[in-house]
């Protein structure tokens, strides 16, 4: 988790002088509770936006937006703590809006936004906005949280972001898989324009189950430049096991930009349809 660039971040708007500061995610008001605290944020919205760095790279960011409730507690609102928690790693990053002037009611609802948290493809986050100061230990909570799922690199807009392109998102292998006689599969895919090796992982499963009954990895050496964008054909041997009939083929490239961590593409061959054979009718009826 990180912030997009480290140029001066602004939260000021007409009628409010405000500065954005790094935060330890442990605001001082936790340790020294105040008697009077503001109410919670209203209408917290998280959206996927895209932003360029100063170097011109494009990154997905969490666009966080919320409004204030129209009550007198805004007189005691000193700022807000924005927290983003990546759920699979428990990594947390916070920033603090520090209000340098008192808020006053005006003719329209106060609205705040922040779009500088860089998020990763195919990750889920919990975004929390805490109004400051935080409540006393038994006080009503004054925060709002929402979960936010970032699409993976198959998503049209995500595909052209720097992290997705670095992991090989622009390569479309157009995989085809054909079942041959004698327990074999022919896998065909389009090579990318880089002299790097690939591996094909064949994992076979029983008809309706998700634990594998066979697995085999096949290595494909780096193609020569004249083979770039050409189709590569590989014949894989299947295990002759009754019922081990659903095959998943994954192709993993080893591009220089992502090495051992490139996006895999996959195709699946389903088990053959079983013909509905009617129950045989006996041609005589036993009498006992």
């Amino acid at each position: 988790l990180r912030l997009l660039d480290h140029r001066a971040l602004v939260c000021s708007q007409p009628g409010l002088n405000c500065t954005v500061k790094n935060s330890t995610c442990l605001d001082d008001s936790w340790i020294h509770p105040r008697n009077l605290t503001p109410s919670s944020p209203k209408d917290l919205q998280i959206q996927l936006h895209f932003a360029h760095t100063q170097q011109g790279d494009l990154f997905p960011v969490a666009h966080i937006e919320w409004t204030l409730q129209t009550d007198a507690s805004i007189l005691y609102l000193e700022g807000a703590e924005l927290s983003v928690l990546q759920l699979n790693t428990n990594e947390r990053l916070c920033v603090r809006f520090e209000f340098l002037s008192k808020l006053r009611h005006h003719h329209r609802r106060w609205r705040f936004t922040f779009s500088h948290f860089v998020v990763d493809p195919d990750q889920e986050y919990e975004v929390t906005v805490h109004h400051l100061p935080k409540p006393i230990p038994d006080g009503d909570p004054n925060h709002q949280s929402k979960n936010f799922l970032v699409p993976d690199c198959e998503h049209a807009r995500m595909k052209v972001t720097t992290p997705c392109m670095s992991s090989g998102s622009l390569w479309d292998p157009n995989i085809t898989v054909e079942t041959l006689e004698a327990h074999q599969l022919r896998v065909s895919f389009t090579l990318w324009n880089e002299s790097t090796h690939y591996q094909i992982l064949l994992t076979s499963f029983p008809h309706m189950e998700n634990h594998s009954c066979f697995e085999h990895m096949h290595h494909i050496p780096a193609p020569r430049p004249e083979e770039f964008h050409q189709r590569s054909n590989v014949t894989l041997t299947l295990r002759n096991l009754k019922g081990c009939c659903r095959h998943q083929v994954q192709i993993q490239p080893f591009f220089s930009s992502c090495l051992n961590d490139c996006l895999r593409h996959s195709a699946t061959v389903s088990c053959p349809e079983m013909p509905d054979t009617p129950e045989p009718i006996p041609d005589y009826m036993p009498l006992w």
Partner: nanobody, 115 residues
Framework: EVQLVESGGGLVQAGGSLRLSCVAS????????MAWYRQGPGNQREFVAT?????????QYADSVKGRFTISRDNVKRTVYLQMNSLKPEDTAVYYC???????WGKGTLVTVSS
């Protein structure tokens, strides 16, 4: 969390032999194909050999090691082996064990072949 631990590396003279082992920490070891890779000084990681799941009857080697290296597995011991014969100075590298399905890697074991 799966752990792959390689051992058996060391210093050997050209023409000599070594046997590398890779022990996996999971009881479902037999369900996974396994592979060996290596990374020589200043080079990218390169494929060495792979073995299929279960009894390991489907095997593939890099052209550079064919006829000299043998990959095998013992599912009871949850171990994959790489027997390396007729070693050459260009085999000097850190050798890594890999589980391709979920891209787990060991920390590697160093093999140095002196001329």
């Amino acid at each position: 969390e799966v752990q792959l631990v390689e051992s058996g590396g060391g210093l050997v003279q050209a023409g000599g032999s070594l046997r590398l082992s890779c022990v996996a920490s999971v009881s479902t070891f037999s369900l996974y194909s396994m592979a060996w890779y290596r990374q020589g000084p200043g080079n990218q990681r390169e494929f060495v050999a792979t073995i299929s799941s279960d009894d390991g009857d489907i095997i593939q080697y890099a052209d550079s090691v064919k006829g000299r290296f043998t990959i095998s597995r013992d599912n009871v011991k949850r171990t994959v082996y790489l027997q390396m014969n007729s070693l050459k100075p260009e085999d000097t590298a850190v050798y890594y064990c890999n589980r391709p399905r979920d891209n787990y890697w060991g920390k590697g074991t160093l093999v140095t072949v002196s001329s």
